[in-house]
Interface confidence: medium
């Protein structure tokens, strides 16, 4: 008799793929644009990325550092009208893209939560949650919660409002903290909260360090759903050298949880390559004319247009990984087991019941390495085969689909491999 199938876990929409943050509408759309109507025209692009949710804004009225002149129910006219927003919601829904609204109150000011009148601000947030839930948004984000006094209790209250409206609504909190204890204390009192933090922001050094950060986090959070990013708002290039971007894309898409990206992460958008552009929100490079300040600064391979035409580009890798992440059971909700593969390497298996299984091997180092995969670290339910098929490599040159002998696996510097193998009873 065939073994019984494992019961599928309840999956919320944010479990099924990546979230895409557009914190600065104007930078995302480029010179002379930057409103909700224009964003509507970019939804097809978001669809092509196979992302499940768009984290938008803040877009509400906010007079810098002025509580009275901050209205979370009103859209800043520079971004458009309530009608424009409704129209964006409708269009997004048709394309199966959920919209999460950032309600960080004082986003133009020094302290995102103002320095005084905490209760007034918290009441404004409460009212805004109810208002925008009625308007049809799929969730909310609040950032910089380390600046919010009694953050845990406020988050619990806001979570109740959000979940009380529908279990299908999401609350994301963001913090600049990278301290695991602080992160855990925020998560403790908020069961379904999705938390973005700087926890992984200094992980770029070695495979061992990244492995220990990831495994510590997963062990500490138990079976609760995680999100994976390098910060609450900033681009990957703020933290990573260019040669590690592909590796991190592969890792973020294949860890158990929701990967969260900022606009531009899919093309390796880098403010440092665009003189004068703000680190937090450089202009999105749709094509070579997107940054006219210094025309020659942008080459085709830095842009969406150029990378869309190149199957070996970072954007093409992002699209492939996003596609895999959203359709493979083992990546959607599979178990995770990290195991030793040698110095400089981080490797793990994702598996779910009798579905196809995935092996990820990441070389964070500057030198080519032979992987000594220590299958003895793995439980019997996740044992390694002798060979696995190469689904993709972050580096060009390997023949995809070819079976690789796991005992003789050699990785190039900064190379990541995604391999697949079948369940064997």
């Amino acid at each position: 008799r065939a073994p019984r199938c494992r019961e599928l876990p309840a999956q919320k929409w944010w479990h099924t793929g990546a979230l895409y943050r557009i914190g600065d509408l104007q930078a995302f759309q480029g010179h002379g644009a930057g409103n909700l109507a224009g964003l509507k025209g970019r939804l097809d692009y978001l669809s092509s990325l196979k992302v499940k949710g768009l984290v938008l804004g803040p877009i509400h009225k906010n007079q810098k550092d002025d509580v009275a002149q901050t209205d979370l129910l009103q859209i800043d006219p520079n971004f458009g009208s309530k009608e424009d927003f409704d129209s964006l919601l409708q269009s997004a829904k048709k394309k199966s893209i959920r919209v999460i609204l950032d309600l960080t109150p004082n986003y133009r000011g020094e302290n995102s939560w103002f320095s005084t009148q905490v209760d007034t601000v918290a009441t404004k947030v409460k009212d805004a949650l109810e208002f925008w839930l009625q308007a049809g948004v799929d969730g909310f984000q609040v950032r910089d919660i380390e600046n919010l006094k009694d953050a845990s209790s406020f988050l619990a209250e806001w979570q109740n409002i959000t979940k009380g409206f529908s279990e299908d609504r999401l609350l994301i909190a963001g913090t600049n903290s990278s301290d695991l204890q602080q992160i855990l204390s925020l998560l403790e009192s908020n069961k379904d909260l999705l938390l973005t933090s700087s926890y992984l922001s200094d992980s770029g050094s070695t495979g061992e360090h990244t492995k220990s950060l990831v495994t510590q986090y997963l062990n500490a959070t138990g079976n609760r759903w995680c999100s994976w990013s390098l910060s609450q708002a900033r681009l990957l290039t703020s933290f990573l050298p260019a040669q590690l971007l592909r590796l991190y894309q592969l890792m973020l898409f294949t860890l158990p949880g929701t990967p969260v990206f900022s606009y531009g992460d899919e093309i390796g958008l880098d403010a440092a390559a665009l003189p004068g552009q703000p680190m937090e929100a450089p202009v999105m490079l749709w094509d070579e004319s997107s940054f006219p300040d210094i025309p020659g600064a942008v080459s085709a391979n830095m842009t969406v247009k150029g990378q869309s035409e190149d199957p070996g580009s970072l954007l093409s890798l992002f699209r492939r990984l996003s596609d895999q992440r959203s359709k493979e059971r083992s990546l959607l909700h599979g178990d995770f087991h990290a195991f030793s593969a040698g110095p400089g390497l981080f490797s793990y298996i994702r598996h779910w019941d009798q579905n196809e299984r995935f092996l990820v091997v990441l070389n964070f180092g500057d030198v080519g390495l032979s992987a000594g995969l220590q299958a003895s670290d793995l439980p019997a339910s996740a044992s390694l085969p002798a060979k696995a098929d190469l689904l993709l490599s972050t580096q060009p040159g390997r023949e995809e689909g070819s079976p690789l002998e796991l005992e003789r696996l050699k990785l190039e510097p900064h190379e990541g491999l995604l391999l697949r193998f079948p369940y064997a009873a």
Partner: antibody, heavy 125, light 113 residues
Framework: QVQLVQSGAEVKKPGASVKVSCKAS????????MHWVRQAPGQGLEWMGI????????SYAQKFQGRVTMTRDTSTSTVYMELSSLRSEDTAVYYC??????????????????WGQGTMVTVSS | DIVMTQSPDSLAVSLGERATINCKSS????????????LAWYQQKPGQPPKLLIY???TSESGVPDRFSGSGSGTDFTLTISSLQAEDVAVYYC?????????FGQGTRLEIK
């Protein structure tokens, strides 16, 4: 009126570091970029890099990568340029220069409408 | 890097006469998307910082006397002083801002004959 006032002349030994300041007044500091340009005695002008006043992001000319650090303090409307591992060929007048802003497009083409008076840095053993 | 080459290195012109300084870039600084030439001209007098005269190859900075004009496109540019005045004695620099690093010409010294 709009002006940039730089710190005074410095004499340094090879291998040392120098930090030059540039205080802006008469305009909204955070709306403009600031650049550093140097000029060796009797020589031409050499662009060193840029700091975006609003966000502090920087971009340095390749030649100075690893040796130059540009920072800013918005509370005092001041930018700083620190050059380390000084050698005799770093002897020059160092200028801060405000990047132009096109008020119609809010783009920042990199030419310089306001300059500091210059700071002479002499590197000598 | 884009190399900017000025000619001549020095120039002596009589008061009231026309002075012409040339600047050549190693690659075009004309941007096809907006048809702008990313080139500026500066004047530097002894002991002073440079002063912006012309940008976009031909747009005069406000307050600059209208005897100063800029022309050219692509790789070849000219700064013209239609009627030289005594206060125009200085070194003149062209600068490209088409690409980083920003680069300047080596300078042209203008004197009175």
């Amino acid at each position: 009126q709009v002006q940039l006032v730089q710190s005074g002349a410095e004499v340094k030994k090879p291998g040392a570091s120098v930090k030059v300041s540039c205080k802006a007044s008469g305009y909204t500091f955070t709306s403009y970029q600031m650049h550093w340009v140097r000029q060796a005695p009797g020589q031409g002008l050499e662009w060193m890099g840029i700091i975006n006043d609003k966000h502090g992001s920087t971009s340095y000319a390749q030649k100075f990568q690893g040796r130059v650090t540009m920072t800013r303090d918005t509370s005092t409307s001041t930018v700083y340029m620190e050059l380390s591992s000084l050698r005799s060929e770093d002897t020059a007048v160092y200028y801060c220069a405000r990047g132009y802003e096109d008020s119609n497009t809010h783009q920042h083409p990199i030419f310089f409408d306001i300059w500091g008076q210059g700071t002479m840095v002499t590197v000598s053993s | 890097d884009i190399v900017m080459t000025q000619s001549p290195d020095s120039l002596a012109v009589s008061l009231g006469e026309r002075a012409t300084i040339n600047c050549k870039s190693s690659q075009s600084v004309l941007y096809r998307h907006n048809n702008n030439n990313y080139l500026a001209w500066y004047q530097q007098k002894p002991g002073q910082p440079p002063k912006l005269l012309i940008y976009w190859a031909s747009t005069s900075e406000s307050g600059v006397p209208d005897r100063f004009s800029g022309s050219g496109s692509g790789t070849d540019f000219t700064l013209t002083i239609s009627s030289l005045q005594a206060e125009d004695v200085a070194v003149y620099y062209c600068q490209q801002y088409y690409n980083t690093p920003i680069t300047f010409g080596q300078g042209t010294r203008l004197e009175i004959k």
